[in-house]
Every structure is written in structure tokens, then in C-alpha cells.
């Protein structure tokens, strides 16, 4: 390419920056353990970390977890992207009565226009069914005159809504205008949890939240409650709990109305890519080659790369690199690229901790 | 030194099949993808295929779906592009590169490139 060679050129002598044949451009070389966000980076700000799948990277710089949309009556909404959470909704039929961060914390059925009624707006996942009286004048559904009371100024009759949470059973039913009640199918075996805060009977100001306890007269001591799994976070929202179910994890601590629960890697493994509340990736203790030691790289698909150790260090089997993260894998074999320069080796410092636990604890 | 070394071009008549490889030596920095491109006499550089490296993902250029592979041997350090039912549209420089996956994209950086190896496809 002679017409390239001046561009070339200028990224010469320049450890920084290197020069892509395929778009004709220098481009910034992100740091070991970065990763572009762009085909050519530009400058520092192009480089992020790299989280495991179903993590994604927040506004902090955290490997943060993916909400799942694994409830029966969620369904994904948006993926979880590198840098942004899987968002869930109600799946369609229902709407979201006590939202989440990215998620909903209870769904409930659409309400079905009672008699006389019609729809004015039909139910999103976002919000419940508006109803209107089917005609201005007295509905002709109406068995007699004095069944028929139009609505006070101002108010649009709304059959109450059926609430659904994780729980399963068969179908519900309500009370609704005038005493006749009205049954719901669910589509999937939903209803109610029977230890739900929330009844259809008993006033709520806020759906899906109640009291932890019942209020003392005269006290504000009422404060929000989440539904099963999620907790009350330092913004006041519900927050799905993390899940310690991957076969690496322990629970560490539960999952409490304000705080999360906390995963660590189970025993004989450790913590190689942080998250909130958990761990990304765990591994194995290393066990080291006579003469081998690995070569930390935070990199999306888990390559390792394998070299000497520096001379007069002995492998200690149990290394911390300068990060603080171990190393991603001991097996050689997820890597196509191999150092075969003994004098590029990382210095690993044989007295640093060896972190445990991720949760910053 | 970084250095990509291709191999296994050379002259082969339409309809028949080439293997190239690419060794790499030295450390790759960060590198978790390779893929091969190509330029044809006069014409600008074409990206042909690529893999990810750790997950063995790979992705073709529509040109050579179906008719080129690509794989790797991780014990040899070797990256590999075999190609079959070749065309005189597929006479061209065949390089390799190495780089990084781009985040939230199957596209990667190519940040260390071979010298190349010339394949002619004639009768």
C-alpha cells in the first residue's frame, strides 16, 4: 500500500497506536484488560472493560448483573448489552402495578370492562385497562334504572386489577361493581402469591409495597416493602436481589428488605471478575506447571496467554496479578496466541492478598 | 517482535481448494480475534472471515460463505483459512490479522497484520 505509508508511518515509534490496514487509520491501542468500543479507537475513552456474559458495565465502571426475565409473567423487553441491563416487562395481558429497576416487581392481569363498560384505552405493559360507560346516556346492559348510577364527574369505572407474582396456581377471581365477580384466566398458572403484601380486599396506596408491620396509630413508621427476591435500594426503588444459582456460587448473605444478597465463589474457587453483589467469574485455585505461569488478561472470551516466570521468582500457585483479578483460566488451550517472550513478563507480586470475595467486603 | 506469517498460497485452477495458515509468534496483545482479508490486483483490501478466539465464533464475508472455513489450532498457534470451490474473483493478497473484539459489535480491531500470500486462481 504505498499510498498508506505516510499514515502508516505516523504511528510508527508510537507503542500507543497502531496502524489498521482494513480502515486506512492509526488507532489508539487500548491498555491490556480494555476493550474497544469503537473498530479504531481514537483516544483512552474508546477503551472499557469487558464484562462476562449476562453482566454489563454501569455508570461506576462495575461488571453489575443483567436483570433475568426468568418470572412467568416477564418477558425481555430490551438485551442485556455490554453496556446496558436486560430490561424486562409483563408480558402481554398484564401490566406492571410495582415497577423495578429494568424490571417489573408485580404484574397484574388487565382488568375486563364490566358490563356496560367498553374500553376507552386498552391496557399496555406499562398500564392497566381504561374503562368508559358504552354510552352517554343509560346503558341498555342496565336490568333496571336504579342499577344504573352514572359514574361521579370526573371518575372513569375501572374493574380492579388481578394481581400476579411468582406463585402459581390456577386462575383468580374478584369482587367488581355492583357484586358480581369476575374471572380471570391466566394464561400460565399465576395468581397471587397467598402470602402476597398485597390484597385485592385491603386498601393500598401502593400497590405490591406494604407495611413491614402493621403501622402503630398516628406512626409513619410504614415503610415500602418489596416483593419476595428484591429489596428496597438507597433510592427508594425495588431492586431484583442477585442470584447465587450458577454452580460456582455460595450464597454469602441473603437477600434483606435494604440490602441485597451476596454471592462469593464456592469453596477451592476464586473471585476473577468482580461484580455488584457477586462474582463474574470464578475459577479454580491456579495449579501451576513447574514452569509455567499465567498471564492475567480480562478478556471477553476468556483468552489466556502462557509464559515463564521472571527469573528468580518461583511460581507461588496462587498469584494476584496487578489488578487484582486472577487469572482468567490455567488451561492453555482456549488460546490461540502464545507469549513466547520470557523478557515481556508482568512482575506478580507473591505477598499480595488474594481476594476471596468480590462484594467489596 | 509481534509477527503473523501466512502461508500456503500459490497458483490453483477454478473449482479446486487451497489451505492457508498464519502462525503467530510472539505476545499478541489483549488479541482475542483473527481473520484474514484480502486484496485483488487494483482493488482495495476485503475482509474475507474471522473467529473469535475463545468462543471459536466465526463470520464470513458473503462473497465466501459456504465455500471458505476458517478455524485455529491452539496448540500450534496457527490460524487457518481453507478454501474451496475457488473462483477467478478470488485471486488476491490473502493477509492475516490479529486484534480485539469491539464491544456490543462481532466487528474486531486489527491491530497486527502478516505480510501476506498470494493466491491466483487460473486455468
Known amino acids: 500500500f504505498p499510498q498508506d505509508r505516510p499514515f502508516e508511518d505516523t504511528c510508527h515509534g508510537n507503542p500507543s497506536h497502531y496502524y489498521d490496514k482494513a480502515v486506512r487509520r492509526c488507532c489508539y491501542r487500548c491498555p491490556m484488560g480494555l476493550f474497544p468500543t469503537q473498530q479504531c479507537p481514537q483516544r483512552p475513552t474508546d477503551c472499557r472493560k469487558q464484562c462476562e456474559p449476562d453482566y454489563y458495565l454501569d455508570e461506576a465502571d462495575r461488571c453489575t448483573a443483567c436483570v433475568t426475565c426468568s418470572r412467568d409473567d416477564l418477558v425481555e423487553k430490551t438485551p442485556c448489552a455490554w453496556n446496558s441491563s436486560r430490561v424486562c416487562e409483563c408480558r402481554p395481558g398484564m401490566f406492571c402495578s410495582t415497577s423495578a429497576v429494568n424490571s417489573c416487581a408485580r404484574c397484574f392481569f388487565h382488568s375486563v370492562c364490566p358490563a356496560g363498560m367498553i374500553v376507552k384505552f386498552p391496557g399496555t405493559a406499562q398500564k392497566n385497562t381504561v374503562c368508559e360507560p358504552a354510552s352517554p346516556g343509560v346503558s341498555p346492559a342496565c336490568a333496571s334504572p336504579e342499577n344504573c348510577k352514572e359514574p361521579s364527574s370526573g371518575t372513569i369505572p375501572q374493574a380492579k386489577p388481578t394481581p400476579v407474582s411468582p406463585a402459581t396456581s390456577s386462575a383468580s377471581t374478584m369482587p367488581v361493581r355492583g357484586g358480581t365477580r369476575l374471572a380471570q384466566e391466566a394464561a400460565s398458572k399465576l395468581t397471587r402469591a397467598p402470602d402476597s403484601p398485597s390484597s385485592v380486599g385491603r386498601p393500598s396506596s401502593d400497590p405490591g409495597l406494604s407495611p413491614t408491620q402493621p403501622c402503630p396509630e398516628g406512626s409513619g413508621d410504614c415503610r415500602k416493602q418489596c416483593e419476595p427476591d428484591y429489596y428496597l435500594d438507597e433510592a427508594g426503588r425495588c431492586t431484583a436481589c442477585v442470584s447465587c444459582s450458577r454452580d460456582d456460587l455460595v450464597e454469602k448473605t441473603p437477600c434483606a428488605w435494604n440490602s441485597s444478597r451476596t454471592c462469593e465463589c464456592r469453596p477451592g474457587m476464586i473471585c476473577a471478575t468482580s461484580a455488584t453483589n457477586s462474582c463474574a467469574r470464578c475459577v479454580p485455585y491456579p495449579i501451576c506447571a513447574a514452569e509455567t505461569v499465567t498471564k492475567p488478561q480480562d478478556m471477553a472470551e476468556k483468552d489466556t496467554t502462557f509464559e515463564a516466570p521472571p527469573l528468580g521468582t518461583q511460581p507461588d500457585c496462587n498469584p494476584t496479578p496487578e489488578n487484582g483479578e486472577a487469572p482468567a483460566s490455567t488451561s492453555p488451550t482456549q488460546s490461540l496466541l502464545v507469549d513466547s517472550q520470557a523478557s515481556k513478563t508482568l512482575p506478580i507480586p507473591t505477598s499480595a492478598p488474594v481476594a476471596l470475595s468480590s462484594t467489596g467486603k | 517482535e509481534v509477527q503473523l506469517v501466512e502461508s500456503g498460497g500459490g497458483l490453483v485452477q477454478p473449482g479446486g481448494s487451497l489451505r492457508l495458515s498464519c502462525a503467530a509468534s510472539?505476545?499478541?496483545?489483549?488479541?482475542?480475534?483473527m481473520g484474514w482479508f484480502r486484496q485483488a490486483p487494483g482493488k482495495g483490501l476485503e475482509w474475507v472471515a474471522r473467529?473469535?478466539?475463545?468462543?471459536?465464533?466465526?463470520y464470513y464475508a458473503d462473497s465466501v460463505k459456504g465455500r471458505f472455513t476458517i478455524s485455529q489450532d491452539n496448540s500450534k498457534n496457527t490460524l487457518y483459512l481453507q478454501m474451496n470451490s475457488l473462483r477467478a474473483e478470488d485471486t488476491a493478497v490473502y493477509y492475516c490479522a490479529a486484534g480485539r473484539v469491539v464491544l456490543g459489535a462481532v466487528v474486531c480491531t486489527n491491530e497486527y497484520w502478516g505480510q501476506g500470500t498470494l493466491v491466483t486462481v487460473s486455468s
Open positions: 473467529i473469535h478466539t475463545g468462543s471459536g465464533s466465526t
Open positions: 510472539g505476545y499478541i496483545y489483549s488479541s482475542n480475534c
